[in-house]
């Protein structure tokens, strides 16, 4: 595989990762697919420092991150352990609220206007942030 040593055009480098900030919205799954087509993933927040960096760039706008509980427990899209990892939920969140009337609960996490996290309906068209790590082999699969 090949290694990425610098960030693509229009991406922002920070602490050996590259970040891309959308300027429009998509449902969580579509945002996830967008990042994957970029050989990236929805942002995974692992520290308060990273939280502040992302928050600075997105401003007071609802923005998807790579955290969901669509299959039961909360999971980060890159496999980072949720239970032992960094969290920044709003008070009384996540609450898997069913009162929105859209069917089901709330299975996808986003940054709220103050940067703290909330769970919401995954179909809502929020902005999103993609992240990819530098110096990580791209793991190009062998051709059969």
């Amino acid at each position: 595989g090949s290694e990425r040593t610098c960030c693509p055009v229009n991406w922002v480098e920070h602490e050996r990762s590259c970040y891309w900030f959308s300027r429009s919205g998509k449902a969580w799954a579509d945002a996830d697919n967008y990042c994957r087509l970029e050989d990236a993933h929805l942002v995974v927040v692992t520290s308060w420092e990273e939280q502040k960096f992302v928050q600075h760039h997105i401003g007071p706008v609802n923005t998807w991150m790579g955290l969901h509980d669509q299959n039961g427990p909360w999971k980060w899209v890159d496999g980072t352990d949720y239970e032992t990892g960094f969290k920044n939920w709003r008070p009384e969140q996540p609450d898997d609220w069913y009162g929105h009337g859209l069917g089901g609960g709330e299975d996808c996490a986003h940054f709220t206007d103050d940067g703290r996290w909330n769970d919401d309906v995954c179909q809502r068209p929020y902005r999103w942030v993609c992240e990819t790590e530098l110096d990580k082999a791209s793991q190009e699969p062998p051709l059969l």
Partner: antibody, heavy 122, light 106 residues
Framework: EVQLLESGGGLVQPGGSLRLSCAAS????????MNWVRQAPGKGLEWVSA????????FYADSVKGRFTISRDNSKNTLYLQMNSLRAEDTAVYYC???????????????WGQGTLVTVSS | DIQMTQSPSSLSASVGDRVTITCRAS??????LNWYQQKPGKAPKVLIY???SLQSGVPSRFSGSGSGTDFTLTISSLQPEDFTTYYC????????FGGGTKVEIE
């Protein structure tokens, strides 16, 4: 100049297999996701499959999932579509197309190759 | 999948006419809408991306507008080379295309 050139089309019997190729030039191939889009004779356009620049992430239309496999060889600047268990309804011109994005999150297909015709018939 | 409905499926017009083609999405796609032109026996070429941005090299007589579910492609003054087929495509979700609009000489 960006160029895409498809090859590998032809006549195949139902249930048969075929592998299409798309040779790319004029851009840094490994930096771009690529797509296959098809068009049945006299019909509209249908997206078939996409693959990320590294080849690590792939996506398929429901109509071809489990039968078609998209892949790429970045050392050869070539995109592939392996088509198995072919059906009459897979008859179409198959185009490869480069994925282009804007700063906000939209993406589209530009440019497209000239296409290669796949005919599935007994 | 998001369904894209293009209308009309065909239209007749004359050189110099102003022509409008519409595209309606089955749900809001914000502005994730692209327009392509396809000439017989050729591959499609992008005209408009992100609903209203004109692709480099495309004549300014082509314009796009709309947001949410309803979009339009306008050709302000038809030229002989514009008599061909046009497609819309959404990229909010898994890509889907409209059925096409064939612009014919009246």
């Amino acid at each position: 100049e960006v160029q895409l050139l498809e090859s590998g089309g032809g006549l195949v019997q139902p249930g048969g297999s075929l592998r299409l190729s798309c040779a790319a030039s004029g851009f840094t191939f490994s930096s771009y996701a690529m797509n296959w889009v098809r068009q049945a004779p006299g019909k509209g356009l249908e997206w078939v499959s996409a693959i990320s620049g590294s080849g690590g992430n792939t996506f398929y239309a429901d109509s071809v999932k489990g039968r078609f496999t998209i892949s790429r060889d970045n050392s050869k600047n070539t995109l592939y579509l392996q088509m198995n268990s072919l059906r009459a309804e897979d008859t179409a011109v198959y185009y490869c197309a480069k994925r282009v994005t804007d700063y906000g999150g939209n993406d589209w297909f530009d440019p497209w190759g000239q296409g290669t015709l796949v005919t599935v018939s007994s | 999948d998001i369904q894209m409905t293009q209308s009309p499926s065909s239209l007749s017009a004359s050189v110099g006419d102003r022509v409008t083609i519409t595209c309606r999405a089955s749900q809001s796609i914000i502005n994730y809408l692209n327009w392509y032109q396809q000439k017989p026996g050729k591959a499609p070429k992008v005209l408009i991306y992100t609903a209203s941005s004109l692709q480099s090299g495309v004549p300014s007589r082509f314009s796009g507008s709309g947001s949410g579910t309803d979009f339009t492609l306008t050709i302000s003054s038809l030229q002989p080379e514009d008599f061909t087929t046009y497609y819309c495509q959404q990229s909010y979700s898994t890509p889907t295309f409209g059925g096409g609009t064939k612009v014919e000489i009246e």
